[in-house]
Structures are given as C-alpha cells and as structure tokens.
C-alpha cells in the first residue's frame, strides 16, 4: 500500500475489425483501477470493464446492438483499495473516446476467397461471406446482411504467366469475369465501401491461383 | 469531506448471515465506485466487493458466490449480504467510496466463531 494520485487516461483509440470493437487506452495503471461507460448520444451511461486493470475492453456486445448509432465511451481512473489517497477529494478523474460509429469507421477485414469455377472461357469466383457479431433474431448476420450494396467487391486477376492485373467490381459475392482458354489465373479481392470517407477499403485476400485446390476447372 | 458510517458487524456462528450497511454523509455521485474491503489480523487490506453506479459488480476471489453487494444510489448507500460465513471470514469490515481518491469508513467488526 501507499499513496499516490491517480492520472487520468490518455490516447483512447478504438480498433474495430467487422464490427469486433475494442477501445484501448494508456498507461498501464500503477496503484489504479479502471472502468469504462459507453453510451450512444441519447443513452445512459452502461458500465464496461468494471474495476479492471486492462487497458483496453471490448465493446462489441455493446455497438453491435445498433452499428449506425454514434457511441462516446469514457475511461474512469480509480485509487487502487490498498491506496491511501493524497489527492483533492471529488469526482474521479475521466478521458473522453473519440465518437465512434461502426457502420461507418469499422475496419473491413481481409476477404477470402472461397472458390473459382471455370466453364470453358469464364470463371466464376465466389468470396467468403464473412459472419459478423452483429445479432438480429438471434442469427449472426453475415458482412453482405449488414452492409447490402454499400459493400462491393473488387476483384484483381491476372494470367500466372505475366504481371498485367485486370480487375471486376461486383456487389454481390460473386464475380464472373472472361479469361483467355488454356491459361492459368491468380486472383485476388479486396472489400470496399465506395460512399465511406474513411476505411473504405480493406487489405487484399491472399492470392489463389488456378491449378492449385480451390478452384474447379471444366472443360467445355 | 464525505464521512462513510459502518453498521450491521458482530457476532455469527460459522455457517451463519450478516448484513452490513454503509451510508454517506453527504451525496454520492453515480461516477463512483463504492464497496466494502476487509482486514484481517496480520494480513493486508484485501477487497470484498465493489459496486457502480449502475450496479455492476466485482468481488474478491475468496468471494466464491457467498456474498452480494447492492447499492442505493438515492440513499447513498451501500450493502453487503454475507452468507455461508466462516471463522476465516473474520475481520473488520471497511466501506469505501473511490472517485477521485479513497474515502473510508471507520471498520465495523465482523467476528464468525462458534
């Protein structure tokens, strides 16, 4: 035991990766604990993270239950139990979030590519519909559910022999694009939400090339 | 400053119940946490129970779903159920208010033998 002062929470950031949301902050508490509200701008305060000595909580249970809402969390600082206080008495020392709104700042993760079908000259190449935390009628709703045609695909595809890429838009999860007959392909995607000003795109899916297992091929 | 007054500690045999209460002096914010911590002879300051405003809790590991801690935010107030007791449950009992520091009740006596 001792006694100290309590600081006040710094550099509150959120991480949030289709909608699994995070808020993480500084410093590491030394003779301190910490609790975390969250609130939409006409809600109450919830308590999140109660008496922890993390720095960071996760929040998902909470943005989920309505992502187009605009949420603010604080981050309260609390003397420890086994701290004998030196400071001024009154209300306990808080950090305001940044105001953070899922549907439109949540990272889109990294797509992956399910499958590709060739049928003589076309290709039909089918991306993984990625199951979110956001619940409705007790069902995980996929990213398609939730963002509907705000969320377009684009596609990179190029001939394994030479490095021109071509791409395709799509915004649905499949594509059905031309390719030269006899000839190997590598594709890629990437995740975009065109109307977004922020995050709108999300890194490339790993590269799946014809001739490897995932795809199908054929002959017509 | 906020004066934090103990009541309900005594005498139990093991097994047995007691119910402590604690009330400010004067109005507790919902931004604080309150809650009960404990001393034993010869060991250190260890949490019971803490509460918030809106009534999330937290209790110490030896806690083991024996007591509940409950708060009255219009009274400012706080309270602890214990149940189950044991001799190893002895102790003076300390009500806490955390804001922006500690405030500290004077103990109440909680003494479990047979």
């Known amino acids: 035991s001792g006694t100290t002062n309590t600081v006040a929470a710094y550099n509150l950031t959120w991480k949030s990766t289709n909608f699994k949301t995070i808020l993480e902050w500084e410093p590491k508490p030394v003779n301190q604990v910490y609790t975390v509200q969250i609130s939409t701008k006409s809600g109450d305060w919830k308590s999140k993270c109660f008496y922890t000595t993390d720095t960071e909580c996760d929040l998902t249970d909470e943005i989920v239950k309505d992502v187009k809402q605009t949420y603010l969390a604080r981050v309260f600082s609390y003397p420890a139990g086994n701290v004998e206080s030196t400071g001024s008495a009154g209300e306990p020392l808080y950090e305001n979030s940044p105001e953070f709104t899922p549907y439109l700042e949540t990272n889109l993760g990294q797509p992956t590519i399910q499958s590709f079908e060739q049928v003589g000259t076309k290709v039909n190449v089918t991306v993984e519909d990625e199951r979110t935390l956001v619940r409705r009628n007790n069902t995980f709703l996929s990213l398609r559910d939730v963002f509907g045609k705000d969320l377009i695909y684009t596609l990179y595809y190029w001939k394994s022999s030479s490095s021109g890429k071509k791409t395709a838009k799509t915004n649905t999860n499949e594509f059905l694009i031309d390719v030269d007959k006899g000839e190997n392909y590598c594709f890629s995607v990437q995740a975009v939400i065109p109307s977004r000003t922020v995050n709108r795109k999300s890194t490339d899916s790993p590269v799946e090339c014809m001739g490897q297992e995932k795809g199908e091929f054929r002959e017509i | 400053a906020v004066q934090l007054v103990e009541s309900g500690g005594g005498l139990v045999q093991p097994g047995g119940s007691l119910s402590l209460s604690c009330a400010a002096s004067?109005?507790?914010?919902?931004?604080?946490?309150m809650g009960w911590y404990r001393r034993s002879p010869g060991k250190e300051r260890e949490l019971v129970a803490v509460?918030?405003?809106?009534?999330?809790?937290h209790y110490g590991d030896f806690v083991k779903g024996r007591f509940a801690i409950s708060r009255d935010n219009v009274k400012n107030a706080v309270y602890l159920k214990m149940n189950f007791l044991t001799p190893e449950d002895t102790a003076v009992y300390y009500c806490?208010?955390?804001?922006?520091?500690?405030?500290w009740g004077q103990g109440t006596q909680v003494t479990v033998s047979s």
């Open positions: 806490n208010a955390a804001g922006r520091r500690n405030h």
């Open positions: 004067e109005m507790i914010s919902s931004t604080y946490i």
């Open positions: 509460i918030s405003g809106d009534g999330v809790t």
